[in-house]
């Protein structure tokens, strides 16, 4: 039960993707408003979003605060003219989020293949480190900061020629490669946790191919 | 405050088994790695391997594989490391460790105080 | 697999300034190996000093600090007190696993 002419929240969702955080949730709102708690398991209950008419809520400055907590939040429906009123029970209705990890579940965000270099048969490919909006000491740390060895990449690339792709992996951002003299090769990248049981995979980089801008070639 | 807090010291007979215990609290116990550490008398340290118990993913030193079982109850925040076919040198000190996470860190910050497993027939 | 080699021992005087130093069979030792140091006193728990190559622990004096010295990872101790006599461990890991060094045990005298 609640106040009437309110509606509880429902199909609460996390959208997550390099830390940044968002709770959405429906329905858009009719005569009403609402208010977003956020908490961590022992910790107390903060207000976010006050008596908005949006259906989603940035709770990153939260949760950046310590991105390995479980985080529980609620969303409070209240009548659009008068945010004072109750439930019958004597409080707003409201209703909980799933739990939320950020550490194990924020999804990786897309990698960027900064450069690459040939030297030889040789190929050196430069992933960028994404900057999250974690911070320490007020730096914001990059994706590998956070995630340390727990973080791989995994490299896709072919002859331009063919399309029979081979793979690499690295726990750092580079891969040294061979390559065969005189042909002309493309690469995506992947973001990969092995370690979790969700969200392991980021999407594919965008291709980059030699013989374009991004590249160097030396021959030695 | 973190503490990870291992259960008493074990004898055992030779080709036994045997199932040590780390409770942890002070943190959330799913996000971290448990690290287990060997150390016989007179020795240094072994890392023996490594479990995240919110995803039960684990790593394990080749030379302890197939004799060694990872695993953690994350509604007691407890992780247990199963040492099977015990010799007399698997005699040691055996530890659960945790990192220092500020942002990012990895390792071997927070120790436990040490299950002794004495392995003698 | 990788072998970590460290001092077997080390003196310093009270008040100076030791280096311990961290070597990797498989060449330089660099930030992806995320070199943590820990220390051991005569009959007491490990404790960790430093983790992934230079971060303290709250608890660990500012005496302390990691880092990496062309290829290999490095401990120096500012100031060494008596208290500071102990076995440091250095830990490196390699993609997939850790490796501890042997130890260096480090006196004050």
């Known amino acids: 039960s609640g106040t009437t002419n309110t509606v509880a929240a429902y199909n609460l969702t996390w959208k997550s993707t390099n830390f940044k955080t968002i709770l959405e949730w429906e329905p858009k709102p009719v005569n009403q408003v609402y208010t977003v708690q956020i908490s961590t398991k022992s910790g107390d209950w903060k207000s976010k979003c006050f008596y908005t008419t949006d259906t989603e809520c940035d709770l990153t400055d939260e949760i950046v605060k310590d991105v390995k907590q479980t985080y529980l939040a609620r969303v409070f429906s209240y009548p659009a003219g008068n945010v004072e009123s109750t439930g019958s029970a004597g409080e707003p209705l409201y209703e909980n989020s799933p739990e939320f990890t950020p550490y194990l579940e924020t999804n990786l965000g897309q990698p960027t293949i900064q450069s690459f270099e040939q030297v030889g048969t040789k190929v050196n490919v430069t992933v960028e480190d994404e900057r999250t909006l974690v911070r320490r000491n007020n730096t914001f740390l990059s994706l590998r900061d956070v995630f340390g060895k727990d973080l791989i990449y995994t490299l896709y690339y072919w002859k331009s020629s063919s399309s029979g792709k081979k793979t690499a992996k690295t726990n750092t951002n580079e891969f040294l490669i061979d390559v065969d003299k005189g042909e002309n090769y493309c690469f995506s990248v992947q973001a990969v946790i092995p370690s979790r049981t969700v969200n392991r995979k980021s999407t594919d980089s965008p291709v980059e191919c030699m013989g374009q801008e991004k590249g160097e070639f030396r021959e030695i | 405050e973190v503490q990870l807090q291992q259960s008493g010291a074990e004898v055992m007979k030779p080709g036994a088994s045997v199932k040590i215990s780390c409770k942890a609290s002070g943190y959330t116990f799913s996000s971290y790695w448990i690290e287990w550490v060997k150390q016989a008398p007179g020795q240094g340290l072994e890392w023996i391997g490594e479990?995240?118990?919110?995803?039960?993913?684990?790593k394990y030193n080749e030379k302890f594989k197939g004799r060694v079982t990872f695993t953690a109850d994350t509604s007691t925040n407890t992780a247990y490391m199963e040492l099977s076919s015990l010799r007399s040198e698997d005699t040691a000190v055996y530890y659960c460790?945790?990192?220092?996470?500020?942002?990012?860190?990895?390792?071997?910050?927070?120790w436990g105080q040490g299950t002794l497993v004495t392995v003698s027939s | 697999q990788a072998v970590v080699t460290q001092e077997p021992s080390l003196t310093v005087s009270p008040g100076g300034t030791v280096t311990l130093t961290c070597r990797s069979s498989t060449g330089a030792v660099t930030t992806s190996n995320y070199a943590n140091w820990v220390q051991q006193k005569p009959g007491q728990l490990p404790k960790g000093l430093i983790s992934g190559t230079n971060n303290r622990g709250p608890w660990t004096t500012a005496r302390f600090s990691g880092s990496i010295l062309g290829d290999k990872a490095v401990l120096t101790l500012w100031g060494a007190h008596t208290e500071d006599e102990a076995v440091y461990y250095c830990?490196?890991?390699?993609?997939?696993?850790?490796?501890f060094g042997g130890g260096t045990k480090l006196t004050v005298l």
């Open positions: 479990i995240l118990p919110g995803s039960a993913s684990t």
């Open positions: 460790a945790r990192d220092y996470y500020y942002g990012s860190s990895y390792g071997f910050a927070y």
């Open positions: 830990a490196l890991w390699y993609s997939n696993h850790w490796v």
